[in-house]
Interface confidence: low
Amino acid sequence: QPVESFPLDFTAVEGNMDSFMAQVKSLAQSLYPCSAQQLNEDLRLHLLLNTSVTCNDGSPAGYYLKESRGSRRWLLFLEGGWYCFNRENCDSRYDTMRRLMSSRDWPRTRTGTGILSSQPEENPYWWNANMVFIPYCSSDVWSGASSKSEKNEYAFMGALIIQEVVRELLGRGLSGAKVLLLAGSSAGGTGVLLNVDRVAEQLEKLGYPAIQVRGLADSGWFLDNKQYRHTDCVDTITCAPTEAIRRGIRYWNGVVPERCRRQFQEGEEWNCFFGYKVYPTLRCPVFVVQWLFDEAQLTVDNVHLTGQPVQEGLRLYIQNLGRELRHTLKDVPASFAPACLSHEIIIRSHWTDVQVKGTSLPRALHCWDRSLHDSHKASKTPLKGCPVHLVDSCPWPHCNPSCPTVRDQFTGQEMNVAQFLMHMGFDMQTVAQPQGLEPSELLGMLSNGS
């Protein structure tokens, strides 16, 4: 006999969220001894029943699920992890990163972190939701629609994996959902932009038009800008993003959103992988999270920051990147873009720490929920005291004091931000302020090597 549950809609809670959360926590703790089941943070692996929908190597794709029976919210998270776009670099990926191409060694459980956590302290936004983590094993930015065959050494079925996961989840409670949030980081973030409308369409066709489908794209809003130093398209990392995607689409039999595809000529579908081009064509509301100085963007632009002195040209290039990115988010009403040098955020445990203009990401997402209320369209007038368009305006990396620690891309060592920015040629006043130093002090310290 199933226990009757009373779903609470936390988006309606206004006023003092901290006080409310404290009450909920206290209630939960007082009820906990009555509960027979242990609170389990883990998401459990389910390989797809339809074994024809596979990872690159033909092993079945799958998803990790943690149900929350009292909730009508479903969070489907698409994992990231670059891509491969020809036989050679896919072979190399299979040798070095097999987990991203095969389900054979996936663990039976995963712990939900960040936005996938069921702890209100770690996830004040959607801790009560049904959590789904979809591992990335198609290497195609979630766009592929081709199976393994004699001709094709690898399957690329990213777009089909999402469709199949949704189909299977309908039998596990998704059919009763009020909101489905398709989220993802890095390649998964781009995957959100490529698939969110298709998921909405799929649910409509299957007879679930009342489920509101929304997107949350983290660190997947890339620019097809000019590289700092042009290199030939040899491997995944040095290949210019436009060229890598152009080649990839053909190799993966990649599919892009229909409305975007219609805007470009045949052979030009690669344009739809770039957020600022695909976003205006999307019907579903999408919240964009993007570091202004994204490490993956810098990597494909052949910028490698090691703390070594930087030429004036590179400093200007980096500042210009932040400016360009800020410009592309100008007309994105729901966005969160801190001026930090980093990559990915939403499934980090400390995703609540970063703020833009005094607002954290979970708070901004809560405001976004409120602004959408029961309609599919974003309200044009922002709610008072509840901002959803949060883009840093200060112009250099790490000028936001809540940025995560800067780490050397190669050694992983924490870098002294003041020195790092000095090497990049930023003016002393600019560098000193967020470090809590006077320019003269900073100059003295750096020049005497202390």
Epitope: Q355, K357, G358, S393, C394, P401, Q433, G436, E438, M445
Partner: antibody, heavy 119, light 111 residues
Framework: EVQLVESGGDLVKPGGSLKLSCAAS????????MHWLRQAPEKGLEWVAY????????SYANTMKGRFTISRDNAKKTLSLQMTSLRSEDTAIYYC????????????WGTGTTVTVSS | DIVLTQSPASLVVSLGQRATISCRAS??????????MHWYQQKPGQPPKLLIY???NLESGVPARFSGSGSGTDFTLNIHPVEEGDATTYYC?????????FGSGTKLEIK
């Protein structure tokens, strides 16, 4: 549990020297800038010195420059403050504190060690 | 150095009422939309404890009765409703530039 424990406080004569230590545990010490602060009896809080995570940046309060030296050993997770030419006005409880790198505030404090400078 | 003037020096508030403490900086401690002002509570014989950071952010584990506001040079710490255990000393601190400085403290008494 995140913890800072100071030691080395003592009674010392004016002009004398003393070395304070601070042992860190429960967090990645090498990730954080560290400060020494002090509080004279029945007085307010006063900042003493700062050292960045990799010891690349050192800074001192004006009245302590040249007399105090801050240092750290990341492998041993210890912070030190070498004090020389001590004066009676240096009498205080000395605290080590962790600098949160998201804005320069002190999010973890030690319990303090007492330094008394008197003849 | 930036001087922080805290007021009042002492404050008597009834149990359950609101306590308001002010901190004024001699120069702006805000930059690029962020205010580098923080608040601490210090009980006798104990080290200070962080309550509020970057003007308005509640430190983890601190009750929601504490709140901070302000920008530029004027900042406020509010405690509402005041409880018995809140009777102690409160300090503001800035980290806009080195040296970080503290206010002279406000002693809160509960009646």
């Amino acid at each position: 549990e995140v913890q800072l424990v100071e030691s080395g406080g003592d009674l010392v004569k004016p002009g004398g020297s003393l070395k304070l230590s601070c042992a860190a545990s429960g967090f990645t010490f090498s990730d954080y800038g560290m400060h020494w602060l002090r509080q004279a009896p029945e007085k307010g809080l006063e900042w003493v010195a700062y050292i960045s995570s990799g010891s690349t940046t050192l800074s001192y309060a004006n009245t302590m420059k040249g007399r105090f030296t801050i240092s750290r050993d990341n492998a041993k997770k210890t912070l030190s403050l070498q004090m020389t030419s001590l004066r009676s006005e240096d009498t205080a409880i000395y605290y080590c504190a962790r600098k949160n790198y998201n804005g320069g505030y002190f999010d973890v404090w030690g319990t303090g060690t007492t330094v008394t400078v008197s003849s | 150095d930036i001087v922080l003037t805290q007021s009042p020096a002492s404050l008597v508030v009834s149990l359950g009422q609101r306590a308001t403490i002010s901190c004024r900086a001699s120069k702006s401690v805000s930059e690029s939309g962020y205010s580098y002002m923080h608040w601490y509570q210090q009980k006798p014989g104990q080290p200070p404890k962080l309550l509020i950071y970057l003007a308005s952010n509640l430190e983890s584990g601190v009750p929601a009765r504490f709140s901070g506001s302000g920008s530029g040079t004027d900042f406020t710490l509010n405690i509402h409703p005041v409880e018995e255990g809140d009777a102690t000393t409160y300090y503001c601190q800035h980290s806009r530039v080195l040296p970080p400085t503290f206010g002279s403290g406000t002693k809160l008494e509960i009646k």
